[in-house]
Interface confidence: medium
C-alpha cells in the first residue's frame, strides 16, 4: 500500500507522458489522477514504466474501479495486464473480441497463465458459447486451447466453430475430448465430398465409432498409420482384416512396425490368424485355425 502524501508543487500530471517515469512511487500516487490515467491508458504501454511504477498505476485503477475495470480501460491495459490477478479479472465483463485479442497479445508465445485462463473463461461464459471467431482467436494464440477444455465445456462448442480447428489444435486432446468433438466435426463437414471430407475429419477420428470407420473403409481413404494409432481401441477391435486393409490402403504395411502397440496389438488378438496371413506382413498372435471365436460383448448385449 502506497502512503497518501500531497503532490509537490508543479508536479501534478496534466497528461500521461514520459516525464512520469522519473516520478517516485509516492509521487505517482499523489500526482496522477486516476481518471486521467483511465482515459489515457493507451499511452501507458508506450512509456517504459518500471514494474514498481506499474504497481502504483494498478493500485490507482483498483481504487477508481473497485467493482472491476470497464472494457474501455481493459482493452488498453497492455503490459499492465501482467500485473492482474485472476481475482481482479473475475470482476471484469469482457465482451469485445478486440479486447480479448489485445490482452492475449501481451502473453503471446508463452504458456497460458492463470490470468489468461481466467480471462478466456470470463469471455466465453459472457458469450454463452464458443463461437467460431472466438475459437479462431484462441487457437491462433494457443493451439492446445481446445484440449484444455473439459468434455462438458466442449459440449458448448457449436459445430460451425469446428471449421476453425486445425490438426495441431487437437494434438493434446484425450479420447474423452475427441468423443465430444467428433460428432460435431461429422456434422460440420457432412456436405463435403469423400476425399475432402476425410482430410477435414481425419484429426477428429480418435472419437469415431466402429460404424463410421467401417464406412470410411469403403471410400478408399488411405488412412495413415499415425491416424490409425490414435483411433479408439474399442472402435478398432470389431473391424475385419479386409476392412482394415481397405481403410489403410498402401499404409497397411505399417501394421508390422506397430504390432506390439495398441490398438494394433489388441486388434491382432481378435483376428483369425489365417485372415492376418492374407496380408502377407508376418503378423503373429491371431486366433489359431479351428478355434471358435465367441464375442462375449455381443452375448451380454443379447441377454
Amino acid at each position: 500500500e502506497v502512503e497518501k502524501t500531497a503532490c509537490p508543487s508543479g508536479k501534478k500530471a496534466r497528461e500521461i507522458d514520459e516525464s512520469l517515469i522519473f516520478y517516485k512511487k509516492w509521487e505517482l500516487e499523489a500526482c496522477v489522477d486516476a481518471a486521467l490515467l483511465a482515459t489515457q491508458m493507451d499511452r501507458v504501454n508506450a512509456i517504459p514504466f518500471t514494474y514498481e511504477q506499474l504497481d502504483v498505476l494498478k493500485h490507482k485503477l483498483d481504487e477508481l474501479y473497485p467493482q472491476g475495470y470497464p472494457e474501455s480501460v481493459i482493452q488498453h491495459l497492455g503490459y499492465l495486464f501482467l500485473k492482474m490477478s485472476p481475482e481482479d479479472i473475475r470482476k471484469w465483463n469482457v465482451t469485445s473480441l478486440e479486447t480479448l485479442k489485445a490482452l492475449l497479445e501481451v502473453n503471446k508465445g508463452h504458456e497460458m497463465s492463470p490470468q489468461v485462463a481466467t480471462l478466456i473463461d470470463r469471455f466465453v461464459k459472457g458469450r454463452g458459447q464458443l463461437d467460431k471467431d472466438t475459437l479462431d482467436t484462441l487457437t491462433a494464440f494457443y493451439p492446445g486451447y481446445l484440449c484444455s477444455l473439459s468434455p462438458e465445456e466442449l459440449s458448448s462448442v457449436p459445430p460451425s466453430s469446428i471449421w476453425a480447428v486445425r490438426p495441431q489444435d487437437l494434438d493434446t486432446c484425450d479420447p474423452r475430448q475427441l468423443d465430444v468433438l467428433y460428432p460435431k466435426a461429422r456434422l460440420a463437414f457432412q456436405n463435403m465430398n469423400g476425399s475432402e471430407y476425410f482430410v477435414k475429419i481425419q484429426s477428429f477420428l480418435g472419437g469415431a465409432p466402429t460404424e463410421d470407420l467401417k464406412a470410411l473403409s469403403q471410400q478408399n481413404v488411405s488412412m495413415d498409420l499415425a491416424t490409425f494409432m490414435k483411433l479408439r481401441t474399442d472402435a478398432v477391435l470389431p473391424l475385419t482384416v479386409a476392412e482394415v486393409q481397405k481403410l489403410l490402403g498402401p499404409h497397411v504395411e505399417g501394421l508390422k512396425a506397430e504390432e506390439r502397440h495398441r490398438p494394433v496389438r489388441d486388434w491382432i488378438l481378435r483376428q483369425r490368424q489365417d485372415d492376418l496371413d492374407t496380408l502377407g506382413l508376418g503378423l503373429q498372435g491371431g486366433i489359431p485355425n479351428g478355434y471358435l471365436v465367441l464375442d462375449l460383448s455381443m452375448q451380454e448385449a443379447l441377454s
Epitope: 514520459e18 522519473f22 518500471t50 514494474y51 508463452h110
Partner: antibody
C-alpha cells in the same frame, strides 16, 4: 553472435558536435529498447537515455535532455547518439547497450548486451 | 536518483579464495543487477533479478539481498575473474550504477 559495435568517437573541440553510431548484429534489433551509457575517466557508469523499438518513445536522463539526441534506423540495425554543445566533462567512453527483454516481451531492468565502447575526448 | 554505494572499492585475492562485495542503495529497490568489466572489454551481465545467473555465467558467481542491501559473491576466485564489478538498479529512473569494485589477483 550477438554484438554491438560503437563508432564515431574522437577528439572534438568544446562547443562542437559529434554523432556516434552503434551497429547491432546477431539479433532482431527492431524488437529491443536500446540505451546509451557513458563512463568518464576514473568515474562510474552513467545512463544517458533510451529509445523504444519503433522510435516513438525516447527518454533521457534529465541533465542531458537538451544536449543529446538518441535515434535509430531499424533498416540499418543502427543506433545513434547525436551530441551537441560538447564540454570537457563530456569526455568519456560511450557504450551502447541492449535492454533485456522480459519473458513476456516487457522490457526488463537490466542491460543484457553491451558494446566495447567508443572514446570521445572534448579538448581544445 | 537512487545512489548506489559499492564496497570495497578494491580487492586483492588469491586464486581459490572466496570473494564478497556489497552494494547499498539509497532507497529500496526491487532487484539488483551485477555486471563484470575486464580492461578494454565490453561490460557483461552476470546476475539479473538479484540472484539469477545470466546465460553462460559460471555457477561460482552468485547474488543475494533485498531492499537496500545486496551482496555479490565469487565462491572460488579464478584468474579470469580479475575485473571490475558494477551493481545496477532500475527500480526507478534513471537507472544507476555503483562506483565499482576492482578485483585483482594477488
Amino acid at each position: 553472435e550477438v554484438q554491438l559495435v560503437e563508432s564515431g568517437g574522437g577528439l572534438v573541440q568544446p562547443g562542437g558536435s559529434l554523432r556516434l553510431s552503434c551497429a547491432a548484429s546477431g539479433f532482431d534489433f527492431s524488437r529491443y529498447w536500446m540505451s546509451w551509457v557513458r563512463q568518464a575517466p576514473g568515474k562510474g557508469l552513467e545512463w544517458i537515455g533510451e529509445i523504444n523499438p519503433d522510435s516513438s518513445t525516447i527518454v533521457y536522463t534529465p541533465s542531458l535532455k537538451d544536449k543529446f539526441i538518441i535515434s535509430r534506423d531499424n533498416a540499418k540495425n543502427t543506433l545513434y547518439l547525436q551530441m551537441n554543445s560538447l564540454r570537457a566533462e563530456d569526455t568519456a567512453l560511450y557504450y551502447c547497450a541492449r535492454r533485456g527483454s522480459h519473458y513476456y516481451g516487457y522490457r526488463t531492468g537490466y542491460f543484457d548486451v553491451w558494446g566495447a565502447g567508443t572514446t570521445v575526448t572534448v579538448s581544445s | 536518483d537512487v545512489v548506489m554505494t559499492q564496497s570495497p572499492a578494491f580487492l586483492s585475492v588469491t586464486p581459490g579464495e572466496k570473494v564478497t562485495m556489497t552494494c547499498s542503495a539509497s532507497s529500496s529497490v526491487s532487484y539488483m543487477y551485477w555486471h563484470q568489466q575486464k580492461p578494454d572489454q565490453a561490460p557483461k551481465l552476470l546476475i539479473y533479478d538479484t540472484s539469477n545467473l545470466a546465460s553462460g555465467v559460471p555457477v561460482r558467481f552468485s547474488g543475494s539481498g533485498s531492499g537496500t542491501d545486496f551482496t555479490f559473491t565469487i565462491s572460488r576466485m579464478e584468474a579470469e575473474d580479475a575485473a571490475t564489478y558494477y551493481c545496477q538498479q532500475w527500480s526507478s529512473y534513471p537507472p544507476t550504477f555503483g562506483g565499482g569494485t576492482k578485483v585483482e589477483i594477488k
